[in-house]
């Protein structure tokens, strides 16, 4: 026998209190697939998170981060503080890259300059905190 709940489309739930008819998801909830017996509570984008896409009856809200922060993790589960180019984020805040390392982004860690000599090349342009060295012939 076919499960009557399988006829319930996204945006509804199979309502056991009403002889398994399809009832609409209440506001602030959604069901993204058919045949669900409950709806899922919408994600709230609060604090450092801001709403990129509103929740609808068939899809969850999507968050991103307020200016000065960037997303980390699946579905932007965390917001991390931006730093300037030439810096990296530490437990004590944004710190300049140490000599011999660089970061050309507002996120991530400082990485060592390329060692040109490993490829038998010489340094054409010196590296900075913000830029890698440029190797030449």
């Amino acid at each position: 026998l076919q499960d009557p709940c399988s006829n319930c489309p996204a945006g509804t739930f199979c309502d056991n209190n009403r002889n398994q008819i399809c009832s609409p998801c209440p506001p602030n909830s959604f069901s993204s697939a058919g045949g669900q017996r409950t709806c899922d509570i919408c994600r709230q984008c609060k604090g450092v998170f801001r709403t990129r896409k509103e929740c609808s009856s068939t899809s969850n809200a999507e968050c991103d981060c307020t200016p000065g922060f960037h997303c980390l993790g699946a579905g932007c589960s965390m917001c991390e503080q931006d730093c300037k180019q030439g810096q990296e984020l530490t437990k004590k805040g944004c710190k300049d890259c140490c000599f011999g390392t660089f970061n050309d982004q507002k996120r991530g860690i400082c990485r060592p300059w390329t060692n040109c000599s490993l490829d038998g090349k010489s340094v054409l342009v010196n590296g900075t905190k913000e830029r890698d060295v440029v190797c030449g012939p």
């Epitope: 739930f13 309502d15 209190n17 209440p26 506001p27 017996r37 409950t38 899922d40 509570i41």
Partner: nanobody
Framework: EVQLLESGGGLVQPGGSLRLSCAAS????????VGWVRQAPGKGLEWVSA????????YYAESVKGRFTISRDNAKNTLYLQMSSLRAEDTAVYYC???????????????RGQGTQVTVSS
Amino acid sequence: EVQLLESGGGLVQPGGSLRLSCAASGFTLSHEDVGWVRQAPGKGLEWVSAILDSGGSTYYAESVKGRFTISRDNAKNTLYLQMSSLRAEDTAVYYCARYVYHAGGGVTFDTRGQGTQVTVSS
């Protein structure tokens, strides 16, 4: 026992107003997420409006925005729906609804009352 008793429906001309009431017993309205759903003749249930306990955020269906206002009186344990600029398409049975949160993290809703009939016709 949780009970929801709707009242205030009736026959009204297009452009008219009504105020629906929902008297709650067996639970404290101010601690719950509640709202109004309606069922038009031959149609399925449709959410009209809701008011959420956390901060009292309100939600309205696009079709009623700017015309309907949801509110509650915590002292009277009563939920209201002020309906104005009524249209023929607002004709339906209106039910008071209470959110039901499940252990697995999902949400459904419960309508315990008989509903109140609103008919918009000239």
